[in-house]
Protein backbone atom coordinates (compact mmCIF):
# COMPACT_ATOMS: atom_id res chain seq x y z
CA UNK A 1 0.00 0.00 0.00
CA UNK A 2 2.87 2.37 0.84
CA UNK A 3 4.74 1.23 -2.28
CA UNK A 4 1.72 2.16 -4.37
CA UNK A 5 1.77 5.61 -2.81
CA UNK A 6 5.40 6.04 -3.84
CA UNK A 7 4.60 5.22 -7.45
CA UNK A 8 1.63 7.60 -7.48
CA UNK A 9 3.31 10.44 -5.64
CA UNK A 10 3.62 13.70 -7.58
CA UNK A 11 6.15 15.54 -5.50
CA UNK A 12 6.65 18.36 -7.99
CA UNK A 13 3.99 20.89 -8.75
CA UNK A 14 1.88 18.31 -10.51
CA UNK A 15 2.16 15.55 -13.09
CA UNK A 16 5.37 16.84 -14.69
CA UNK A 17 8.15 17.54 -12.22
CA UNK A 18 11.48 18.39 -13.75
CA UNK A 19 14.83 17.94 -12.14
CA UNK A 20 15.79 21.58 -12.48
CA UNK A 21 13.77 22.79 -9.55
CA UNK A 22 12.38 21.10 -6.50
CA UNK A 23 9.63 23.68 -5.96
CA UNK A 24 8.14 22.20 -2.80
CA UNK A 25 11.41 21.89 -0.93
CA UNK A 26 12.98 25.07 -2.29
CA UNK A 27 9.91 26.92 -1.03
CA UNK A 28 10.21 25.18 2.34
CA UNK A 29 13.86 26.25 2.63
CA UNK A 30 13.03 29.81 1.61
CA UNK A 31 10.38 29.98 4.34
CA UNK A 32 12.68 28.33 6.88
CA UNK A 33 15.55 30.71 6.24
CA UNK A 34 13.21 33.72 6.45
CA UNK A 35 12.08 32.69 9.95
CA UNK A 36 14.48 30.08 11.38
CA UNK A 37 12.92 29.72 14.80
CA UNK A 38 9.28 29.68 13.73
CA UNK A 39 6.92 26.90 12.83
CA UNK A 40 6.29 26.50 9.11
CA UNK A 41 3.23 25.10 7.49
CA UNK A 42 2.05 25.33 3.91
CA UNK A 43 0.41 23.35 1.15
CA UNK A 44 2.67 22.79 -1.86
CA UNK A 45 -0.14 21.42 -3.98
CA UNK A 46 -2.37 24.36 -3.17
CA UNK A 47 0.29 26.98 -3.92
CA UNK A 48 1.31 25.20 -7.13
CA UNK A 49 -2.30 25.23 -8.15
CA UNK A 50 -2.76 28.94 -7.63
CA UNK A 51 0.47 29.73 -9.50
CA UNK A 52 -0.59 27.51 -12.37
CA UNK A 53 -3.92 29.33 -12.39
CA UNK A 54 -2.12 32.65 -12.53
CA UNK A 55 -0.05 31.39 -15.45
CA UNK A 56 -3.31 31.07 -17.41
CA UNK A 57 -3.36 34.85 -17.68
CA UNK A 58 0.36 35.52 -17.86
CA UNK A 59 2.36 36.13 -21.00
CA UNK A 60 5.96 35.95 -22.19
CA UNK A 61 8.62 35.92 -19.47
CA UNK A 62 6.07 36.22 -16.66
CA UNK A 63 4.50 32.91 -17.65
CA UNK A 64 7.89 31.31 -18.20
CA UNK A 65 9.07 32.36 -14.74
CA UNK A 66 5.98 30.85 -13.10
CA UNK A 67 6.22 27.52 -14.93
CA UNK A 68 9.99 27.23 -14.50
CA UNK A 69 9.70 28.27 -10.87
CA UNK A 70 7.24 25.42 -10.36
CA UNK A 71 9.84 23.10 -11.84
CA UNK A 72 7.68 22.21 -14.80
CA UNK A 73 9.16 20.95 -18.00
CA UNK A 74 6.58 21.66 -20.65
CA UNK A 75 8.47 19.63 -23.23
CA UNK A 76 7.20 16.61 -21.33
CA UNK A 77 3.61 17.73 -21.04
CA UNK A 78 1.63 20.47 -22.65
CA UNK A 79 0.22 23.46 -20.81
CA UNK A 80 -3.26 22.17 -21.48
CA UNK A 81 -2.41 18.91 -19.70
CA UNK A 82 -1.02 20.86 -16.78
CA UNK A 83 -4.30 22.72 -16.24
CA UNK A 84 -6.37 19.59 -16.85
CA UNK A 85 -4.24 17.76 -14.30
CA UNK A 86 -4.98 20.40 -11.71
CA UNK A 87 -8.67 20.42 -12.61
CA UNK A 88 -8.85 16.68 -12.00
CA UNK A 89 -6.85 16.93 -8.81
CA UNK A 90 -9.09 19.69 -7.46
CA UNK A 91 -12.19 17.63 -8.18
CA UNK A 92 -10.67 14.65 -6.36
CA UNK A 93 -9.56 16.67 -3.37
CA UNK A 94 -12.86 18.48 -2.97
CA UNK A 95 -14.90 15.31 -3.10
CA UNK A 96 -16.77 14.74 0.16
CA UNK A 97 -15.36 11.73 2.02
CA UNK A 98 -16.22 10.15 5.34
CA UNK A 99 -14.12 11.45 8.20
CA UNK A 100 -12.18 13.71 5.88
CA UNK A 101 -12.63 17.48 5.74
CA UNK A 102 -10.73 19.37 3.09
CA UNK A 103 -11.51 22.87 1.82
CA UNK A 104 -9.17 24.13 -0.84
CA UNK A 105 -9.73 27.15 -3.01
CA UNK A 106 -8.47 30.18 -4.85
CA UNK A 107 -10.02 33.56 -5.39
CA UNK A 108 -9.02 36.75 -7.11
CA UNK A 109 -10.03 40.07 -5.60
CA UNK A 110 -9.56 42.87 -8.11
CA UNK A 111 -9.94 46.61 -7.93
CA UNK A 112 -13.29 47.95 -9.10
CA UNK A 113 -11.91 49.44 -12.30
CA UNK A 114 -10.02 46.34 -13.38
CA UNK A 115 -11.74 44.71 -16.34
CA UNK A 116 -10.98 40.99 -16.37
CA UNK A 117 -10.73 39.15 -19.68
CA UNK A 118 -13.74 36.84 -20.12
CA UNK A 119 -11.54 33.97 -21.31
CA UNK A 120 -9.43 34.13 -18.16
CA UNK A 121 -12.46 34.31 -15.85
CA UNK A 122 -14.12 31.33 -17.49
CA UNK A 123 -10.90 29.25 -17.56
CA UNK A 124 -10.34 30.10 -13.90
CA UNK A 125 -13.85 29.03 -12.98
CA UNK A 126 -13.86 25.88 -15.10
CA UNK A 127 -10.38 24.57 -14.39
CA UNK A 128 -9.71 25.90 -10.90
CA UNK A 129 -13.23 26.48 -9.50
CA UNK A 130 -11.99 29.94 -8.60
CA UNK A 131 -14.07 33.02 -7.95
CA UNK A 132 -13.37 36.65 -8.82
CA UNK A 133 -14.65 39.60 -6.83
CA UNK A 134 -14.60 43.33 -7.54
CA UNK A 135 -13.20 45.00 -4.42
CA UNK A 136 -12.91 48.53 -3.10
CA UNK A 137 -9.31 48.47 -1.88
CA UNK A 138 -9.34 52.13 -0.90
CA UNK A 139 -11.47 51.05 2.06
CA UNK A 140 -8.79 48.74 3.47
CA UNK A 141 -10.85 47.56 6.42
CA UNK A 142 -13.89 46.88 4.27
CA UNK A 143 -11.84 45.02 1.66
CA UNK A 144 -10.13 42.98 4.33
CA UNK A 145 -13.50 42.05 5.82
CA UNK A 146 -14.81 41.07 2.38
CA UNK A 147 -11.82 38.77 1.78
CA UNK A 148 -11.75 37.27 5.29
CA UNK A 149 -15.51 36.71 5.34
CA UNK A 150 -15.32 34.93 2.00
CA UNK A 151 -12.58 32.56 3.16
CA UNK A 152 -14.32 31.96 6.51
CA UNK A 153 -17.50 31.00 4.66
CA UNK A 154 -15.65 28.70 2.22
CA UNK A 155 -13.87 26.90 5.08
CA UNK A 156 -16.97 26.77 7.32
CA UNK A 157 -15.35 29.05 9.86
CA UNK A 158 -12.06 27.18 10.10
CA UNK A 159 -9.95 29.97 8.58
CA UNK A 160 -11.23 33.26 9.90
CA UNK A 161 -8.39 35.74 9.59
CA UNK A 162 -6.58 35.16 6.33
CA UNK A 163 -5.51 38.80 6.11
CA UNK A 164 -4.25 40.80 9.07
CA UNK A 165 -3.70 44.02 7.16
CA UNK A 166 -4.07 45.32 3.65
CA UNK A 167 -2.41 47.91 1.46
CA UNK A 168 -4.98 50.41 0.19
CA UNK A 169 -3.00 50.71 -3.05
CA UNK A 170 -3.71 47.07 -3.92
CA UNK A 171 -5.08 46.31 -7.38
CA UNK A 172 -5.15 42.50 -7.49
CA UNK A 173 -5.03 40.21 -4.47
CA UNK A 174 -4.92 36.50 -4.93
CA UNK A 175 -5.93 34.33 -2.02
CA UNK A 176 -5.29 30.66 -1.68
CA UNK A 177 -6.54 28.69 1.30
CA UNK A 178 -6.61 25.08 2.43
CA UNK A 179 -8.04 23.51 5.56
CA UNK A 180 -7.67 19.85 6.40
CA UNK A 181 -8.97 17.67 9.17
CA UNK A 182 -9.26 13.93 8.88
CA UNK A 183 -9.74 11.00 11.16
CA UNK A 184 -6.83 8.68 11.79
CA UNK A 185 -7.39 5.16 10.55
CA UNK A 186 -6.99 4.14 14.17
CA UNK A 187 -7.68 6.69 16.84
CA UNK A 188 -5.43 7.60 19.74
CA UNK A 189 -7.02 6.83 23.07
CA UNK A 190 -8.23 10.05 24.75
CA UNK A 191 -7.36 8.56 28.12
CA UNK A 192 -3.77 8.16 27.02
CA UNK A 193 -3.35 11.89 26.32
CA UNK A 194 -1.34 13.55 29.07
CA UNK A 195 0.52 16.79 29.63
CA UNK A 196 4.22 16.33 28.87
CA UNK A 197 7.30 18.47 28.32
CA UNK A 198 8.13 19.64 24.82
CA UNK A 199 11.66 21.00 24.34
CA UNK A 200 11.36 23.98 21.98
CA UNK A 201 15.07 24.55 22.56
CA UNK A 202 17.40 23.16 25.22
CA UNK A 203 16.47 26.18 27.36
CA UNK A 204 12.76 26.51 26.51
CA UNK A 205 10.35 23.85 27.67
CA UNK A 206 6.56 24.00 27.23
CA UNK A 207 3.83 21.65 28.45
CA UNK A 208 1.77 20.06 25.68
CA UNK A 209 -1.05 17.49 25.57
CA UNK A 210 0.81 14.40 24.32
CA UNK A 211 -1.25 11.72 22.60
CA UNK A 212 0.00 8.15 22.74
CA UNK A 213 -0.77 4.91 21.03
CA UNK A 214 1.03 1.61 20.69
CA UNK A 215 0.53 0.03 17.29
CA UNK A 216 2.20 -1.21 14.15
CA UNK A 217 3.45 1.79 12.17
CA UNK A 218 5.41 2.39 9.01
CA UNK A 219 8.79 3.38 10.39
CA UNK A 220 12.38 3.97 9.41
CA UNK A 221 15.60 5.32 10.81
CA UNK A 222 17.45 7.48 8.25
CA UNK A 223 21.10 7.31 9.34
CA UNK A 224 22.26 9.67 6.57
CA UNK A 225 19.99 12.48 7.69
CA UNK A 226 19.94 11.53 11.39
CA UNK A 227 16.20 11.31 11.82
CA UNK A 228 13.37 8.89 12.49
CA UNK A 229 10.29 8.85 10.26
CA UNK A 230 6.90 7.41 11.12
CA UNK A 231 3.83 7.14 8.89
CA UNK A 232 0.40 7.44 10.47
CA UNK A 233 -2.43 6.70 8.02
CA UNK A 234 -5.62 8.72 7.84
CA UNK A 235 -8.89 7.18 6.81
CA UNK A 236 -8.99 7.15 3.03
CA UNK A 237 -5.90 7.81 1.03
CA UNK A 238 -3.82 10.27 3.03
CA UNK A 239 -0.91 9.58 5.35
CA UNK A 240 0.84 11.84 7.82
CA UNK A 241 4.59 11.48 8.00
CA UNK A 242 6.24 12.73 11.16
CA UNK A 243 10.00 13.23 11.05
CA UNK A 244 11.95 13.51 14.30
CA UNK A 245 15.51 14.75 13.76
CA UNK A 246 18.12 13.63 16.25
CA UNK A 247 19.01 16.39 18.72
CA UNK A 248 20.66 19.32 16.99
CA UNK A 249 20.12 17.82 13.55
CA UNK A 250 17.05 19.78 12.38
CA UNK A 251 19.02 21.86 9.89
CA UNK A 252 20.73 18.81 8.46
CA UNK A 253 17.34 17.20 7.84
CA UNK A 254 15.91 20.42 6.35
CA UNK A 255 18.84 20.68 3.96
CA UNK A 256 18.35 17.08 2.91
CA UNK A 257 14.65 17.42 2.10
CA UNK A 258 14.00 16.63 -1.54
CA UNK A 259 11.72 14.68 -3.81
CA UNK A 260 14.30 11.90 -3.81
CA UNK A 261 14.43 11.80 0.01
CA UNK A 262 10.66 11.58 0.32
CA UNK A 263 10.42 8.82 -2.26
CA UNK A 264 13.20 6.95 -0.48
CA UNK A 265 11.39 7.19 2.88
CA UNK A 266 8.11 5.98 1.43
CA UNK A 267 9.88 3.09 -0.29
CA UNK A 268 11.94 2.03 2.72
CA UNK A 269 9.21 2.06 5.34
CA UNK A 270 8.92 -1.14 7.36
CA UNK A 271 6.10 -2.09 9.69
CA UNK A 272 7.29 -1.79 13.27
CA UNK A 273 5.66 -2.01 16.68
CA UNK A 274 5.96 1.46 18.20
CA UNK A 275 4.85 3.25 21.28
CA UNK A 276 4.20 6.58 19.60
CA UNK A 277 3.90 9.84 21.54
CA UNK A 278 2.71 12.76 19.45
CA UNK A 279 1.58 16.24 20.55
CA UNK A 280 -2.04 17.11 19.96
CA UNK A 281 -1.89 20.35 18.00
CA UNK A 282 -3.41 22.62 15.45
CA UNK A 283 -0.93 24.16 13.06
CA UNK A 284 -1.40 26.91 10.59
CA UNK A 285 0.80 28.87 8.26
CA UNK A 286 0.00 32.17 6.64
CA UNK A 287 2.32 33.60 4.00
CA UNK A 288 2.61 36.64 1.77
CA UNK A 289 3.98 34.70 -1.16
CA UNK A 290 4.92 37.84 -3.08
CA UNK A 291 7.72 38.22 -0.53
CA UNK A 292 8.97 34.63 -0.81
CA UNK A 293 8.50 33.50 -4.41
CA UNK A 294 11.02 35.94 -5.94
CA UNK A 295 13.81 33.93 -4.29
CA UNK A 296 12.56 30.96 -6.33
CA UNK A 297 12.72 32.97 -9.54
CA UNK A 298 9.04 33.94 -9.64
CA UNK A 299 9.23 37.72 -9.42
CA UNK A 300 7.88 39.46 -12.55
CA UNK A 301 4.28 38.87 -11.70
CA UNK A 302 4.58 41.03 -8.55
CA UNK A 303 6.35 43.94 -10.24
CA UNK A 304 5.71 46.56 -12.90
CA UNK A 305 7.35 44.11 -15.36
CA UNK A 306 4.35 41.77 -15.04
CA UNK A 307 2.72 40.67 -18.26
CA UNK A 308 -0.78 39.75 -17.19
CA UNK A 309 -2.38 40.65 -20.51
CA UNK A 310 -4.41 37.45 -20.40
CA UNK A 311 -6.04 38.55 -17.13
CA UNK A 312 -6.79 42.14 -18.05
CA UNK A 313 -5.99 44.48 -20.89
CA UNK A 314 -4.84 47.21 -18.51
CA UNK A 315 -1.16 47.58 -19.28
CA UNK A 316 -0.03 48.39 -15.76
CA UNK A 317 -1.57 45.55 -13.78
CA UNK A 318 0.44 43.40 -11.38
CA UNK A 319 -0.39 41.10 -8.46
CA UNK A 320 -0.20 43.23 -5.31
CA UNK A 321 -0.39 40.36 -2.84
CA UNK A 322 -0.59 36.61 -3.00
CA UNK A 323 -1.75 35.23 0.31
CA UNK A 324 -1.66 31.56 1.27
CA UNK A 325 -3.05 30.09 4.45
CA UNK A 326 -2.99 26.43 5.44
CA UNK A 327 -4.56 24.97 8.58
CA UNK A 328 -4.51 21.44 9.94
CA UNK A 329 -5.83 20.07 13.22
CA UNK A 330 -4.23 16.99 14.77
CA UNK A 331 -6.12 15.26 17.56
CA UNK A 332 -6.94 11.79 18.79
CA UNK A 333 -10.03 11.03 16.76
CA UNK A 334 -9.98 8.10 14.41
CA UNK A 335 -12.41 6.14 12.32
CA UNK A 336 -12.03 3.14 14.50
CA UNK A 337 -11.28 2.99 18.18
CA UNK A 338 -7.76 2.51 19.37
CA UNK A 339 -7.10 -0.82 20.99
CA UNK A 340 -8.63 -0.78 24.44
CA UNK A 341 -6.23 -0.99 27.36
CA UNK A 342 -7.17 -4.57 28.18
CA UNK A 343 -6.48 -5.76 24.66
CA UNK A 344 -2.93 -4.44 24.63
CA UNK A 345 -1.82 -7.20 26.95
CA UNK A 346 -2.48 -9.76 24.24
CA UNK A 347 0.57 -8.26 22.44
CA UNK A 348 2.91 -9.12 25.27
CA UNK A 349 5.73 -10.38 23.08
CA UNK A 350 5.40 -7.53 20.61
CA UNK A 351 5.43 -5.03 23.43
CA UNK A 352 8.78 -6.21 24.59
CA UNK A 353 10.15 -5.42 21.13
CA UNK A 354 8.32 -2.15 20.75
CA UNK A 355 10.30 1.02 20.52
CA UNK A 356 9.30 4.27 22.14
CA UNK A 357 9.17 7.27 19.78
CA UNK A 358 8.47 10.56 21.53
CA UNK A 359 7.95 13.73 19.51
CA UNK A 360 8.96 16.04 22.32
CA UNK A 361 11.18 18.43 20.35
CA UNK A 362 10.76 20.27 17.03
CA UNK A 363 9.79 17.92 14.21
CA UNK A 364 8.73 17.98 10.58
CA UNK A 365 5.50 16.71 9.13
CA UNK A 366 4.13 15.88 5.70
CA UNK A 367 0.61 14.99 4.76
CA UNK A 368 0.63 13.08 1.50
CA UNK A 369 -1.86 11.33 -0.67
CA UNK A 370 -0.81 11.24 -4.31
CA UNK A 371 0.56 14.73 -3.78
CA UNK A 372 2.17 16.58 -0.95
CA UNK A 373 -0.89 18.17 0.58
CA UNK A 374 1.09 19.78 3.39
CA UNK A 375 4.63 20.23 4.57
CA UNK A 376 5.58 21.82 7.83
CA UNK A 377 7.83 22.16 10.80
CA UNK A 378 6.37 22.15 14.30
CA UNK A 379 8.66 24.22 16.47
CA UNK A 380 6.20 24.81 19.25
CA UNK A 381 2.89 22.90 19.23
Amino acid sequence: EMKKRVEDLHVGATVAPSSRRDFTFDLYRALASAAPSQSIFFSPVSISMSLAMLSLGAGSSTKMQILEGLGLNLQKSSEKELHRGFQQLLQELNQPRDGFQLSLGNALFTDLVVDLQDTFVSAMKTLYLADTFPTNFRDSAGAMKQINDYVAKQTKGKIVDLLKNLDSNAVVIMVNYIFFKAKWETSFNHKGTQEQDFYVTSETVVRVPMMSREDQYHYLLDRNLSCRVVGVPYQGNATALFILPSEGKMQQVENGLSEKTLRKWLKMFKKRQLELYLPKFSIEGSYQLEKVLPSLGISNVFTSHADLSGISNHSNIQVSEMVHKAVVEVDESGTRAAAATGTIFTFRSARLNSQRLVFNRPFLMFIVDNNILFLGKVNRP
Epitope: V113, D115, R138
Partner: antibody, heavy 118, light 108 residues
Framework: EVKLLESGGGLVQPGGSLKFSCEAS????????MSWVRQAPGKGLEWIGE????????TYTSSLKDRFIISRDNAKNTVYLQMSKVRSEDTALYYC???????????WGQGTTLTVSS | DIVMTQSHKFMSTSVGDRVSITCKAS??????VAWYQQKPGQSPKLLIY???YRYTGVPDRFSGSGSGTDFTFTISSVQAEDLAVYYC??????????FGGGTKLEIK
Amino acid sequence: EVKLLESGGGLVQPGGSLKFSCEASGFDFSRYWMSWVRQAPGKGLEWIGEINPDSSTITYTSSLKDRFIISRDNAKNTVYLQMSKVRSEDTALYYCARLFYYGTPDYWGQGTTLTVSS
Amino acid sequence: DIVMTQSHKFMSTSVGDRVSITCKASQDVIKAVAWYQQKPGQSPKLLIYSTSYRYTGVPDRFSGSGSGTDFTFTISSVQAEDLAVYYCQQHYSSPPWTFGGGTKLEIK
Protein backbone atom coordinates in the same frame (compact mmCIF):
# COMPACT_ATOMS: atom_id res chain seq x y z
CA GLU B 1 -26.37 58.16 10.43
CA VAL B 2 -23.30 59.63 8.74
CA LYS B 3 -22.94 63.36 9.31
CA LEU B 4 -20.28 65.89 8.31
CA LEU B 5 -20.53 69.35 9.79
CA GLU B 6 -18.31 72.12 8.45
CA SER B 7 -17.63 75.32 10.32
CA GLY B 8 -15.27 78.30 10.21
CA GLY B 9 -16.47 80.09 7.06
CA GLY B 10 -16.91 83.81 6.79
CA LEU B 11 -15.66 87.01 5.25
CA VAL B 12 -11.88 87.41 4.90
CA GLN B 13 -9.78 90.12 3.31
CA PRO B 14 -7.44 89.25 0.44
CA GLY B 15 -4.14 87.96 1.82
CA GLY B 16 -5.79 86.79 5.03
CA SER B 17 -6.00 83.29 6.56
CA LEU B 18 -8.77 81.01 7.69
CA LYS B 19 -9.19 77.49 9.06
CA PHE B 20 -12.22 75.35 8.31
CA SER B 21 -13.17 72.42 10.53
CA CYS B 22 -15.32 69.46 9.63
CA GLU B 23 -16.61 67.27 12.42
CA ALA B 24 -17.65 63.74 11.48
CA SER B 25 -20.08 61.41 13.23
CA GLY B 26 -21.94 58.18 12.56
CA PHE B 27 -19.00 56.19 11.18
CA ASP B 28 -15.50 55.03 12.08
CA PHE B 29 -13.68 58.21 11.12
CA SER B 30 -10.20 56.75 11.63
CA ARG B 31 -10.81 54.26 8.81
CA TYR B 32 -11.61 56.67 5.99
CA TRP B 33 -9.79 59.00 3.65
CA MET B 34 -11.30 62.49 3.84
CA SER B 35 -11.32 65.27 1.26
CA TRP B 36 -12.18 68.89 0.59
CA VAL B 37 -13.98 70.07 -2.54
CA ARG B 38 -15.08 73.60 -3.36
CA GLN B 39 -17.71 75.19 -5.59
CA ALA B 40 -17.51 78.82 -6.69
CA PRO B 41 -20.89 80.60 -7.01
CA GLY B 42 -22.77 79.29 -10.06
CA LYS B 43 -19.80 77.12 -11.06
CA GLY B 44 -18.80 73.44 -11.01
CA LEU B 45 -16.95 71.34 -8.46
CA GLU B 46 -13.21 71.68 -7.87
CA TRP B 47 -11.13 69.14 -6.01
CA ILE B 48 -8.89 70.63 -3.30
CA GLY B 49 -7.18 67.63 -1.75
CA GLU B 50 -7.43 64.53 0.41
CA ILE B 51 -5.89 62.97 3.50
CA ASN B 52 -5.51 59.31 4.36
CA PRO B 53 -6.62 57.75 7.69
CA ASP B 54 -3.30 58.13 9.53
CA SER B 55 -2.30 61.47 7.90
CA SER B 56 0.74 59.89 6.24
CA THR B 57 -0.50 60.74 2.74
CA ILE B 58 -1.95 64.14 1.88
CA THR B 59 -2.39 65.28 -1.72
CA TYR B 60 -3.49 68.61 -3.13
CA THR B 61 -4.46 70.11 -6.44
CA SER B 62 -1.12 71.50 -7.59
CA SER B 63 -2.37 75.08 -7.98
CA LEU B 64 -3.45 75.21 -4.32
CA LYS B 65 -0.79 73.22 -2.49
CA ASP B 66 1.35 76.23 -1.53
CA ARG B 67 -1.51 77.98 0.27
CA PHE B 68 -3.75 75.20 1.58
CA ILE B 69 -3.02 72.64 4.30
CA ILE B 70 -5.25 69.66 5.10
CA SER B 71 -4.91 67.91 8.47
CA ARG B 72 -6.98 65.71 10.74
CA ASP B 73 -7.39 64.74 14.36
CA ASN B 74 -8.79 61.22 14.67
CA ALA B 75 -9.34 61.62 18.42
CA LYS B 76 -11.70 64.51 17.67
CA ASN B 77 -13.19 62.97 14.50
CA THR B 78 -12.31 66.19 12.72
CA VAL B 79 -10.62 67.14 9.45
CA TYR B 80 -9.28 70.65 8.84
CA LEU B 81 -8.54 72.93 5.91
CA GLN B 82 -6.12 75.75 6.67
CA MET B 83 -5.97 78.48 4.00
CA SER B 84 -3.51 81.31 3.78
CA LYS B 85 -2.94 84.25 1.42
CA VAL B 86 -6.54 84.01 0.24
CA ARG B 87 -7.59 85.61 -3.04
CA SER B 88 -10.90 86.73 -4.42
CA GLU B 89 -11.03 83.62 -6.63
CA ASP B 90 -11.08 81.49 -3.46
CA THR B 91 -14.62 82.74 -2.80
CA ALA B 92 -16.67 79.54 -2.81
CA LEU B 93 -18.72 77.04 -0.86
CA TYR B 94 -16.28 74.57 0.75
CA TYR B 95 -17.41 70.98 1.23
CA CYS B 96 -15.76 68.34 3.34
CA ALA B 97 -16.46 64.82 2.13
CA ARG B 98 -15.78 61.23 3.11
CA LEU B 99 -14.07 59.15 0.43
CA PHE B 100 -15.74 55.87 -0.33
CA TYR B 101 -13.33 54.82 -3.07
CA TYR B 102 -10.41 56.46 -4.86
CA GLY B 103 -11.39 60.13 -5.24
CA THR B 104 -15.05 59.24 -4.86
CA PRO B 105 -16.90 60.99 -2.01
CA ASP B 106 -20.05 59.24 -0.83
CA TYR B 107 -21.00 61.65 1.97
CA TRP B 108 -20.70 65.42 1.79
CA GLY B 109 -21.18 68.11 4.41
CA GLN B 110 -23.64 70.92 3.78
CA GLY B 111 -20.72 73.24 2.96
CA THR B 112 -19.33 76.39 4.56
CA THR B 113 -18.88 79.66 2.70
CA LEU B 114 -15.74 81.69 2.28
CA THR B 115 -16.09 85.20 0.90
CA VAL B 116 -12.88 87.01 0.07
CA SER B 117 -13.43 90.74 -0.23
CA SER B 118 -11.84 93.97 0.87
CA ASP C 1 -4.36 67.14 -15.31
CA ILE C 2 -7.01 64.99 -16.95
CA VAL C 3 -9.79 67.18 -18.38
CA MET C 4 -13.36 65.89 -18.23
CA THR C 5 -15.69 67.48 -20.78
CA GLN C 6 -19.48 67.39 -20.58
CA SER C 7 -20.49 68.78 -23.97
CA HIS C 8 -24.06 69.65 -22.99
CA LYS C 9 -24.44 72.35 -20.36
CA PHE C 10 -28.23 71.90 -20.43
CA MET C 11 -30.55 69.08 -21.41
CA SER C 12 -34.30 69.23 -21.53
CA THR C 13 -36.46 66.17 -21.08
CA SER C 14 -39.94 65.06 -20.06
CA VAL C 15 -41.07 62.80 -17.21
CA GLY C 16 -40.91 59.16 -18.32
CA ASP C 17 -38.31 59.83 -21.03
CA ARG C 18 -34.95 58.14 -21.29
CA VAL C 19 -32.07 60.56 -21.16
CA SER C 20 -28.31 60.12 -21.62
CA ILE C 21 -25.58 62.52 -20.55
CA THR C 22 -22.11 62.12 -22.04
CA CYS C 23 -18.67 62.85 -20.70
CA LYS C 24 -15.32 62.69 -22.47
CA ALA C 25 -11.92 62.30 -20.78
CA SER C 26 -8.79 63.91 -22.27
CA GLN C 27 -6.95 60.59 -21.84
CA ASP C 28 -7.69 56.95 -21.11
CA VAL C 29 -9.16 56.59 -17.61
CA ILE C 30 -10.06 52.89 -18.10
CA LYS C 31 -13.34 52.59 -16.11
CA ALA C 32 -12.57 55.09 -13.39
CA VAL C 33 -15.50 57.48 -13.77
CA ALA C 34 -18.11 58.52 -11.20
CA TRP C 35 -21.36 60.48 -11.57
CA TYR C 36 -22.90 62.84 -9.03
CA GLN C 37 -26.27 64.52 -8.76
CA GLN C 38 -26.58 68.00 -7.23
CA LYS C 39 -30.08 69.28 -6.64
CA PRO C 40 -30.63 73.02 -6.18
CA GLY C 41 -29.37 74.21 -2.76
CA GLN C 42 -28.02 70.75 -1.83
CA SER C 43 -24.67 68.99 -1.60
CA PRO C 44 -23.67 66.59 -4.39
CA LYS C 45 -24.74 62.98 -4.10
CA LEU C 46 -22.78 59.97 -5.43
CA LEU C 47 -24.83 57.90 -7.88
CA ILE C 48 -22.38 55.80 -9.92
CA TYR C 49 -18.70 54.91 -9.46
CA SER C 50 -16.23 52.93 -11.57
CA THR C 51 -18.39 53.58 -14.64
CA SER C 52 -21.25 51.23 -13.85
CA TYR C 53 -21.47 50.44 -10.12
CA ARG C 54 -24.56 51.96 -8.54
CA TYR C 55 -23.89 53.34 -5.08
CA THR C 56 -25.94 51.91 -2.20
CA GLY C 57 -29.58 53.01 -2.27
CA VAL C 58 -29.43 54.55 -5.74
CA PRO C 59 -32.54 53.63 -7.82
CA ASP C 60 -31.89 51.28 -10.72
CA ARG C 61 -33.21 53.78 -13.27
CA PHE C 62 -29.74 55.34 -13.00
CA SER C 63 -26.96 53.56 -14.88
CA GLY C 64 -23.55 54.20 -16.37
CA SER C 65 -21.49 52.78 -19.19
CA GLY C 66 -18.34 53.34 -21.22
CA SER C 67 -14.60 52.83 -20.94
CA GLY C 68 -11.39 54.50 -22.03
CA THR C 69 -12.35 58.09 -22.82
CA ASP C 70 -16.09 58.03 -23.55
CA PHE C 71 -18.68 57.64 -20.82
CA THR C 72 -22.45 57.84 -20.63
CA PHE C 73 -24.82 58.32 -17.72
CA THR C 74 -28.41 57.25 -18.35
CA ILE C 75 -31.73 57.77 -16.59
CA SER C 76 -34.07 55.15 -18.07
CA SER C 77 -37.28 56.87 -17.04
CA VAL C 78 -36.94 60.44 -15.82
CA GLN C 79 -38.87 61.45 -12.69
CA ALA C 80 -39.71 65.00 -11.64
CA GLU C 81 -37.28 64.73 -8.70
CA ASP C 82 -34.39 64.09 -11.09
CA LEU C 83 -34.17 67.81 -11.86
CA ALA C 84 -30.54 68.53 -10.97
CA VAL C 85 -27.04 69.19 -12.24
CA TYR C 86 -25.11 65.98 -13.05
CA TYR C 87 -21.32 65.90 -12.84
CA CYS C 88 -18.93 63.29 -14.13
CA GLN C 89 -15.56 62.83 -12.40
CA GLN C 90 -12.48 60.77 -13.19
CA HIS C 91 -11.03 58.79 -10.28
CA TYR C 92 -8.18 57.27 -12.27
CA SER C 93 -5.37 59.72 -11.70
CA SER C 94 -4.63 62.26 -9.03
CA PRO C 95 -3.85 64.87 -7.99
CA PRO C 96 -6.36 66.11 -8.80
CA TRP C 97 -9.40 63.96 -9.28
CA THR C 98 -11.16 66.15 -11.85
CA PHE C 99 -14.83 66.91 -12.47
CA GLY C 100 -16.68 67.75 -15.65
CA GLY C 101 -18.36 71.14 -15.90
CA GLY C 102 -21.82 69.70 -15.19
CA THR C 103 -24.99 69.13 -17.21
CA LYS C 104 -28.19 70.70 -15.96
CA LEU C 105 -31.19 68.48 -16.51
CA GLU C 106 -34.40 70.47 -16.97
CA ILE C 107 -37.85 68.93 -16.94
CA LYS C 108 -40.23 70.25 -19.63
